[in-house]
């Protein structure tokens, strides 16, 4: 895999050493954490840099409570197994033995358990509501522009192909975007829809995981489109498994 | 090894329509992208349209206007390309190449279909 | 959509000569630019993606670069199977993706 040849560092990626050391002396990029060697002309897979978040200094945050069978994320601050494609394991354990079962984007689908627990397969997430609030403007934005503009945004900074940008809603100020991408649609090269999700979650909290590119500048017909908050909810192939007791 | 076999050459009329076809071997079909491509003569290349086989998705060049249709066949990993009201201009070599994801390059292409339109 | 422009359009150069093609994109395309040879009657064949990557069994005597919206194919030492056209093709944005008109090598 090779990065930006002229100063050999990984574009996709800051969380990462580089080195002319690949095939003929070529650019070669490993993330930090793992030492996995990444592909720096798209995403990351989000275990890694889950992994490599974990080895740089870190910040506490609160967490968002889940509803329904839709599981929010508590910002994943965890260190994660990721397999030898980096993608996250199954199973997911602490220094204390305590262990329970992800899904593709690495949130927790299960409750925690012991050493004994098993978690038979990775349980895809196929779909992905980013629920964002803009900041108040002149007026409401065009649904067809707004629309036109996060599709693009998905496809040139995230390599996200529209199709799996199933719609956007917008009711002022609520923006939906929705996600929807099962195993069998990808293609090679196709972008992960949990890997896309997390680099814009990453962008909208200013904490973009880009090289040297600026920050999110989300413009609709010019007119400056500012997140307030965002929530995402994760559906996965196969529902969640909580115990009663976590429910009430 | 990979490869794109379409059908043979076509002489149709204009206003008539033309389905060129392109069967693939040697990898799995439905886990790239196929795209078509025509070439008019001495001229360049011209992105029609891509789909996904694993689910049929499309997307077009608005050139086209509502003109060009893929489709494909997951059963005998054939991809098709209709093309209808044609007129002498869509006179072109169409192909069929595979696509990534990512770089959207094309890395293996179909030997080409010569469509030629005239009254 | 974005615009592809190639120069020259057509170049006249000898065996081991060293030549060298741009692409230039109406916009930043990051470095989603592919470089084609076609030779005559035949289909494209995919030499260079991202910019500069080479595709498998392509010559190391073709190496590609640049970023944004300015880029070069070098071939380092012209052989006579090098006369050809060439084309670049942008992937960056939303369909449709666009391809340069193209420069065609011919012997000097």
């Known amino acids: 895999h090779t990065a930006a040849q002229d100063n050999c560092t990984c574009p996709t990626n800051k969380m990462t050493v580089c080195s002319p050391d690949g095939p003929g002396g070529r650019c070669q990029c490993r993330a930090l954490g793992s030492g996995m060697a990444v592909d720096c002309s798209t995403l990351t897979s989000k275990c890694l840099l889950l992994k490599a978040r974990m080895s740089a200094p870190k910040n506490a945050r609160t967490l968002v409570r889940p509803s329904e069978h839709a599981l929010v994320d508590n910002d994943g601050l965890y260190d994660p197994d990721c397999d030898p494609e980096g993608r996250f394991k199954a199973r997911q354990c602490n220094q204390t033995s305590v262990c329970w079962c992800v899904n593709s984007v690495g949130v927790r689908r299960t409750d925690k358990g012991d050493l004994s627990l098993r978690c038979d397969e990775l349980v895809r997430t196929h779909h992905i509501l980013i629920d964002l609030r803009h900041r108040p403007t002149a007026g409401a934005f065009n649904h067809s522009d707004l629309d036109a503009e996060l599709r693009r945004l998905f496809r040139e900074r995230y390599r996200l192909h529209p199709k799996f940008v199933a719609a956007v809603h917008y009711e002022q100020p609520t923006i939906q975007i929705e996600l929807r991408q099962n195993t069998s649609q990808k293609a090679a090269g196709d972008v992960d829809i949990g890997d896309a999700a997390y680099y814009f979650e990453r962008d909208i909290k200013g904490e973009s995981l880009f090289q040297g590119r600026g920050g999110l500048d989300l413009r609709v017909r010019g007119e400056p489109l500012q997140v307030e908050r965002t929530l995402i909810y994760y559906l996965d192939e196969i529902p969640p498994k909580f115990s009663m007791k976590r429910l009430t | 090894q990979v490869q794109l076999v379409q059908s043979g050459a076509e002489v149709k009329k204009p206003g008539a329509s033309v389905k060129v076809s392109c069967k693939a071997s040697g990898y799995t079909f439905t886990s790239y992208w196929m795209h078509w491509v025509r070439q008019a003569p001495g001229q360049g290349l011209e992105w029609m349209g891509e789909?996904?086989?694993?689910?049929?998705?499309?997307s077009y060049n608005q050139k086209f206007k509502g003109r060009v249709t893929i489709t494909r066949d997951t059963s005998t990993s054939t991809a098709y390309m209709e093309l209808s009201s044609l007129r002498s201009e869509d006179t072109a070599v169409y192909y069929c190449a595979r696509g990534h994801g990512n770089y959207v390059s094309f890395d293996y292409w179909g030997q080409g279909t010569l469509v030629t339109v005239s009254s | 959509d974005i615009q592809m422009t190639q120069s020259p359009s057509s170049l006249s150069a000898s065996v081991g000569d060293r030549v060298t093609i741009t692409c230039r994109a109406s916009q930043d395309i990051s470095n989603y630019l592919n470089w084609y040879q076609q030779k005559p009657g035949k289909a494209p064949k995919l030499l260079i993606y991202y910019t500069s990557r080479l595709e498998s069994g392509v010559p190391s005597r073709f190496s590609g670069s640049g970023s944004g919206t300015d880029f070069t194919l070098t071939i380092s030492s012209l052989q006579p199977e090098d006369f050809a056209t060439y084309f670049c093709?942008?992937?960056?944005?939303?369909?449709?993706?666009?391809f340069g008109q193209g420069t065609k090598l011919e012997i000097k």
């Open positions: 093709q942008q992937g960056y944005t939303l369909p449709p993706y666009t």
């Open positions: 789909i996904t086989p694993s689910d049929g998705y499309t």
